[in-house]
């Protein structure tokens, strides 16, 4: 029925009240149930009405609003602190302790995160987004600057049917169609050659403990790795020669180094530098991310930040040490 | 096949020296940590020291501090257990063991030696 | 420190029996805990860890579940081979801590 410009959907009743006419529904069985799209936000239950918006939400703390949308601090909760002189003492020392592998203490310092402090450092979220990693969707964490919510929020539970030989298969040239989805890495863009690129701005530079030739044998394994984890596809940069950017790493001087090398007396011929692992220049490549989805990097800062994230998560396959997002990459760093 | 064999073991007096040896392949040495593990005879096991050797970071029991050293040589694929001011409780089984995390100490050891005997007397 | 104690410290079972270890830590170790068993004369073996993920190589009957400090391993059907002594160790803080054992003997 409908009464004046006021449109009523079907089983509502028009009512002529004093501040105009209103919808109202005389039994909300035969009316749409304003539920029936789940508008109740992280965990709230969901109430039929016999009003516009045909539902209330029973919110669970800390949220509230009319669809549990916002998130309210409870007053009473002092801002965390890492208190503890052991957590003191241990961070930076290039060994994750999980005891401090924490917010408060900066993920052991860093040591925990790639040597990255705050991978959350720009979201802006109401909610602690890096303790919402919780296999559930939190969406005032579903934002770029957010991490994607750690991907929570798109089916991250989906997995690569064929996985073995989709990794046995990833960037070998030739187009296997049952490879050809995100969560198998798209081939590693083997079914799009003929698709024009679209890299995100920056560069991904990564210290990993393996020699060049060994990252450069395994590199298909290593990017799609890495690529599974950002749900897009990455390669290794090429310099001005059109050579890999895949370097000899010596290894930082972290105090720790500094004081193992007083101790450790050097024997006559010893090298004194030693390769530690490579250090390797990233870009992501969106061509296909794009197509299948809105959660896609446009630049390599928040990438960098999610992969500290799976650091500090322990789901890191690789033995990687620490991650930077480059805007403009010198033609080789050391 | 990841292997790792402890050699350096023997008999010392109290008060002696002794530098134990763990041999480590078919991984990247530097990528995980390693722990020195001891088992007094008939006792149960009892975490001594543990190093990352690609940074060097070294953590110690109570029980070993000041008197216990581990080091670790990447470029012979080595870790050390340098013992001095040895004691009668030091006698054990000592085992070495890797992390399997990385650079995490908070992972479990999934490899083990087959262990060196240590005895201390008089 | 954290303490981890095991119970019971021996127990004799036959082959077919099901099998329950209990451990528990002196303060939360969340889940990174870790199971081994040791067989005389030999170094001990790396069953369980994260206190419920079997290690590669691990057989089915053997599982582990808790968190925080209340810790179970099962063997839900001993096989003659399952004889040995069991260990839990925390690995959450250094000083890393094991529990004192529990020795598995045939009745």
């Known amino acids: 029925s409908s009464c004046g410009q006021v449109k009523c959907r079907k089983g509502e009743q028009c009512v002529h009240t004093a501040s105009g006419p209103r919808c109202f529904c005389p039994s909300p069985r035969d009316c749409e149930s304003g539920c029936a799209s789940s508008p109740c936000q992280h965990g709230g239950s969901c109430h039929p009405q016999r009003q516009p918006p045909y539902y209330s939400c029973q919110c669970a703390p800390p949220f509230s609003g009319s669809r549990c949308e916002l998130y309210t601090a409870p007053p009473s909760t002092p801002p965390a602190t890492c208190l503890s002189q052991y957590c003191a003492d241990k961070a930076r020392d290039g060994v994750c302790d999980e005891a401090c592998n924490s917010h408060a203490c900066q993920w052991d310092g860093g040591d925990c995160s790639l040597t990255m402090e705050n991978p959350w450092a720009n979201c802006s979220s109401p909610l602690p987004c890096w303790d919402y990693i919780n296999n559930q969707c939190d969406e005032l964490c579903n934002t770029v600057e957010c991490l994607f919510d750690n991907f929570e929020c798109q089916g991250n539970s989906k997995t690569c049917k064929y996985d073995k030989y989709c990794a046995d298969h990833f960037k070998d040239n030739h187009c296997d169609q049952g490879c050809n989805s995100e969560e198998c890495g798209w081939d590693g863009l083997d079914c799009a050659a003929d698709q024009p690129e679209n890299l995100a701005e920056g560069t991904l530079v990564i210290v990993v403990l393996m020699p060049p030739e060994q990252l450069l044998q395994d590199a298909r394994s290593f990017l799609r790795a890495l690529g599974t984890l950002l749900h897009t596809n990455l390669r290794i940069k090429r310099d001005s020669q059109g050579e890999l950017m895949v370097y000899p790493y010596y290894g930082e001087k972290s105090a720790a180094m500094k004081k193992q090398r007083m101790t450790r007396r050097s024997l006559p011929g010893e090298q004194e530098q030693e390769v530690a692992g490579s250090k390797v220049f990233l870009e992501i490549d969106n061509r296909q991310c794009v197509q299948d989805s809105d959660h896609c990097f446009k630049n390599t800062d928040a990438a960098a930040a999610l992969l500290a994230s799976h650091a500090i998560q322990g789901t890191l396959s690789y033995p990687l040490v620490s991650v930077v997002s480059e805007s403009l990459t010198p033609e080789r760093t050391q | 096949e990841v292997q790792l064999v402890e050699s350096g073991g023997g008999l010392v007096q109290p008060g002696g020296s002794l530098r134990l040896s763990c041999a480590a392949s078919?991984?990247?040495?530097?990528?995980?940590?390693m722990s020195w593990v001891r088992q007094a005879p008939g006792k149960g096991l009892e975490w001594v020291s543990y190093?990352?050797?690609?940074?060097?970071?070294?953590y110690y029991a109570d029980s070993v501090k000041g008197r216990f050293t581990i080091s670790a040589d990447t470029s012979k694929n080595t870790a050390y257990l340098q013992m001095n001011s040895l004691r009668a409780e030091d006698t054990a089984v000592y085992y070495c063991?890797?992390?399997?995390?990385?650079?995490?100490?908070?992972?479990?050891?999934?490899?083990w030696g087959q262990g060196t005997l240590v005895t201390v007397s008089a | 420190d954290i303490q981890m104690t095991q119970s019971p410290s021996s127990l004799s079972a036959s082959v077919g029996d099901r099998v329950t270890i209990t451990c528990r830590a002196s303060?939360?170790?969340?889940?990174?805990l870790a199971w081994y068993q040791q067989k005389p004369g030999k170094a001990p073996k790396l069953l369980i860890y994260?206190?419920?993920s079997r290690a590669s190589g691990v057989p089915s009957r053997f599982s582990g579940s808790g968190s925080g400090t209340d810790f179970t391993l099962t063997i839900s059907s001993l096989q003659p081979e399952d004889f040995a002594t069991y260990y839990c160790q925390q690995y959450y803080i250094s000083p890393l801590t094991f529990g004192q054992g529990t020795k598995v003997e045939i009745k």
């Open positions: 063991a890797r992390h399997s995390g990385y650079y995490r100490i908070s992972s479990a050891m999934d490899v």
């Open positions: 994260g206190a419920s």
């Open positions: 303060q939360s170790n969340r889940r990174f």
């Open positions: 190093i990352y050797p690609y940074s060097g970071a070294t």
């Open positions: 078919g991984y990247t040495f530097s990528s995980y940590g």
